[in-house]
Interface confidence: low
């Protein structure tokens, strides 16, 4: 008996998602089944279905399949979140490249290589032919899309609409051409799903035919989507387990991108004298292990054979015989020249945190004249003279050009958070440098902290429609979703920007996140008309120690009666004690009978000194923190969410004065909550919004 192939690997999975048909003419077919694999097999074979199956949803609660002749890209269809649903879309219909000869290509390209529009397969004008959809069932000869029903050499083709040209191939790239990676592909998140020998990859969430440790839920930041090639373990390049029981795993053929520069999030901070973190960015010249035994050269196979070669581990700087950490070990190491000792750690290299005599700055660093020329994320600074136009755009005085020499970190705009520089990277135009304030320096970066000389409010009124506040009063509240579940709150401060907390991002893969706006219910129930779901395109981390993140949306939010922005306070302002404020959040972890609706807790502002007393002196607040306490028992930010706002009103204007972050206690009586003080970071926020490019709507 021939073993039936498991076809679920041919589908792209979107967890906790279903498709809703807006167009009632669209057909669907349902049936009770036990597993998603059964749904997949039937969809692939189109067995007993009155249409060509392009996608299906598996309803885990009802153990039911819903087969569709459409997918999420079809018109008349919308995606919807649902705990019990998993959406599977046939990759052939959403792929825009070909594998091999493109026999399985089912995309929507309908133009030939020379730019001629294709003739519909069902038409005999201008060219008569025998390639009728009815004769080639399963080959998807739909519309006038390029196809390769017989698997011919040139790849997908079509009859053309030009009477002079009977047929021509279409210019659809090979998937291996489209896909590219940087370095050894640890950050690769592409859609290659077969190995270099053509074997189909095993899904990461399956344990057959090969059991393995790389379970997506255990490694949320490794991008283990479907069965795509990945490099989670520092191999020379991306790989996958295969569906061949006799081939456990194989590398994938993914070429190196022409511009082989690493993504900002993947670059460890480069150091030469000391170790930062696990030392993955150590680029110094120590070349013995801890006990003095010399290191073996990385490009040598004697006395120890190994695959940690410079060719296999590009971007890891495996030069000479220097200690390095190319594989995510505890610290830099090397193979040794002693045949009896294969590897050893170079634990004699000091830790950066412990090394003294490091560069430092006083006050806000506006007089810093050191030679550091690298940002905290490891990017090399670009020359100041190339960036003067940008600098003039956000400062209103002439910078001291004598200080802006070379590409050294400087603070020409009086930034409260220290020296910075431009990077030359369009995604990260500028960033702070990894320099700390000098030990013992007490120069305040904001003057007159405890005297309310600066009002927090600008002179703008709260928007009111027909004299009644609309839901605009919470329209700035954002639900940050992580893999379809609410994880954190956030505040919409500009159409493309959300202010939230650093702790809200367990994964580096931005595909894992969405921002939901215009909702009142944590699951969006009853909010369908007003809900906006936006992808996240970038995270900008706040100044060191701030715990803030500015989250850039992939497209601007549309401001309406349900979605609005909230104002920021003036930089360095102080809000009077006893000012009434509120914290907002969905409090999704706390209450047994929680109804899923946005909750509010009313607090009042408390001075930092009094706040410290209420914490029995165990907490010392600094200028970057703000304190607010509850009058009633059981109300406070613990019922809200991390990332959510502390909102206060001054001169009839509401503003976000604080951000809820973990680790500072709850607002119970005599134990006020401590928030990140937004006024302290307001200049940073404005500077990011001004200098980072945002997509146009």
């Amino acid at each position: 008996q021939r073993k039936r192939r498991n076809t679920i690997h041919e589908f792209k999975k979107s967890a906790k998602t279903t498709l809703i048909k807006i167009d009632p003419a669209l057909k669907i077919k349902t049936k009770k089944v036990n597993t998603a694999d059964q749904c997949a097999n039937r969809c692939t074979r189109n067995k007993g279905l009155p249409f060509t199956c392009k996608a299906f949803v598996f309803d885990k609660a009802r153990k039911q399949c819903l087969w569709f002749p459409f997918n999420s890209m079809s018109s008349g269809v919308k995606k919807e979140f649902g705990h019990e649903f998993d959406l599977y879309e046939n990759k052939d219909y959403i792929r825009n490249c070909i594998i091999g000869k493109g026999r399985s290509y089912k995309g929507t390209v309908s133009i030939t290589k020379s730019g001629i529009k294709c003739q519909p397969w069902s038409s005999m004008i201008p060219h008569e032919h025998s390639f009728l959809p009815s004769s080639y069932r399963g080959k998807d000869l739909q519309e006038n899309y390029c196809r390769n029903p017989r698997g011919e050499e040139g790849g997908p083709w079509c009859f053309t609409s030009n009477p002079e040209v009977r047929y021509e191939v279409c210019d659809i790239p090979q998937c291996s051409e489209v896909e590219c990676m940087t370095c050894n592909g640890e950050s690769y998140r592409g859609l290659m799903d077969h190995t270099e020998s053509g074997k189909i990859c095993q899904r990461w969430d399956h344990q057959t035919p090969h059991r393995h440790k790389f379970l997506p839920e255990r490694y949320p930041d490794k991008g283990f989507d479907d069965n795509y090639c990945r490099n989670p373990d520092g191999q020379p390049r991306p790989w996958c387990y295969t569906l061949d029981p006799h081939t456990r795993w194989e590398y994938c053929a993914i070429k190196t991108c022409a511009d082989n520069t690493m993504n900002d999030t993947d670059v460890p901070l480069e150091t030469t004298e000391c170790i930062q973190g696990q030392g993955e960015g150590y680029r110094g010249t120590v070349n013995t292990i801890w006990n003095g035994i010399p290191c073996q050269r990385w490009d040598s196979q004697y006395p120890h054979e190994h695959d940690m070669t410079p060719e296999n581990f590009k971007c890891k700087d495996l030069r000479e015989n220097y200690c390095r950490n190319p594989d995510g070990s505890e610290s830099p190491w090397c193979f040794t020249t002693d045949p009896n000792i294969r590897v050893g750690y170079c634990s004699q290299i000091p830790n950066c945190d412990m090394s003294h005599g490091q560069d430092c700055y006083r006050g806000n660093g506006k007089n810093y004249m050191g030679n550091l020329s690298q940002t905290r994320s490891g990017l090399t600074c670009s020359m100041w003279d190339k960036n003067m136009e940008d600098l003039h755009r956000h400062i209103f005085w002439e910078p001291d050009a004598s200080k802006l020499n070379e590409n050294y970190c400087r603070n020409p705009d009086d930034d409260a958070h220290g020296p910075w520089c431009y990077t030359g990277n369009p995604l990260i135009p500028w960033d702070y440098c990894p320099i700390s304030r000098c030990e013992g320096d007490t120069t305040p970066t904001i003057v007159n902290l405890d005297h309310p000389v600066i009002s927090c409010a600008k002179t703008k009124q709260l928007r009111v429609v027909n004299g009644i506040p609309t839901r605009t009063n919470i329209g700035w509240m954002v639900s940050l979703r992580y893999r379809n579940k609410h994880i954190c709150g956030g505040s919409l401060i500009k159409e493309s920007w959300v202010l939230t907390a650093r702790q809200c991002f367990p994964s580096r893969d931005l595909k894992d996140y969405e921002a939901w706006l215009g909702i009142h219910d944590v699951h969006g129930r009853g909010d369908e008309k007003c809900k906006q779901v936006l992808n996240v395109s970038q995270l900008v981390y706040g100044p060191e120690g701030s715990d803030l993140v500015l989250m850039k949306l992939a497209r601007p939010a549309v401001l309406d009666d349900f979605v609005s922005t909230i104002d920021l306070p003036n930089y360095g302002c102080t809000i009077p004690e006893k000012t009434s404020c509120s914290v907002y959040g969905w409090g999704y972890t706390g209450l047994i009978n929680y109804d899923g609706l946005l909750r509010v807790a009313h607090l009042y502002i408390m001075g930092n000194e009094k706040c410290s007393q209420h914490h029995r002196g165990k907490v010392t607040l600094n200028e970057s923190e703000i304190c607010a306490g509850a009058e009633k028992i059981g109300s406070g930010p613990c019922e809200g969410d991390y990332g959510g706002p502390l909102v206060c009103e001054q001169h009839k204007m509401r503003m976000v004065l604080g951000v809820i972050v973990p680790g500072r206690g709850c607002a119970i009586p005599n134990r006020p909550g401590i928030f990140v003080r937004v006024a302290y970071y307001a200049k940073w926020i404005h500077k990011i919004i001004l200098t980072y490019k945002v997509p146009q709507s």
Epitope: T208, P209, R211, K213, F214, L215, P245, D327, G328, V343
Partner: antibody
Framework: QVQLQQWGAGLLKPSETLSLTCAVY????????WSWIRQPPGKGLEWIGE???????NYNPSLKSRVTISVDTSKNQFSLKLSSVTAADTAVYYC??????????????WGQGTLVTVSS | EIVMTQSPATLSVSPGERATLSCRAS??????LAWYQQKPGQAPRLLMY???TRATGIPARFSGSGSGTEFTLTISSLQSEDFAVYYC??????????FGQGTRLEIK
Amino acid sequence: QVQLQQWGAGLLKPSETLSLTCAVYGGSFSTYYWSWIRQPPGKGLEWIGEINHSGSTNYNPSLKSRVTISVDTSKNQFSLKLSSVTAADTAVYYCARGGYDFWSGYYDYWGQGTLVTVSS
Amino acid sequence: EIVMTQSPATLSVSPGERATLSCRASQSVSSNLAWYQQKPGQAPRLLMYGASTRATGIPARFSGSGSGTEFTLTISSLQSEDFAVYYCQQYNNWPPITFGQGTRLEIK
């Protein structure tokens, strides 16, 4: 109670093929991975390879070219074949049960062991 | 492959005393480490897995600790039946699964 019973030829000449079988009694055969591990006289343990009920195998790269592990699910048995043996393959060969997922790659049940001697 | 190194090769301890056996991995194996006891003429017996979890039926005098590259098996008060050879085994990175060369625990 799970029991592993193993058998096979104990004396081989160089270049012959070693052949051992392990039968599993009790417990679920289809849930686990089944391994072969050997121990040369007076030395440590060396992992040879493993197989599951569907025939999916993993082998020690150092022995891969000579090893074949197969499974007969109808009898709850799995077998080891090691070709072109030399004196260096003289060892006690054990069959053992390993966990079904990555997080349980240890061996909780072992066969009694079979001493295989390679000598001309 | 990951090389497991056990020390010492032989450990002499008196009954009733405490024995501490070490195992080092050539690279991190997280907590995916097991310990076995083997007596002459017998198959190995699983003592610990996950670095610190006792297997079924193993007395409380056996305890395991460590993660990453450094691991320890401690026998708090040695009984006569504890004198044997002890092996550590990693299952974090395979194939191949690898064992240490063993530590012989003998009566002093």
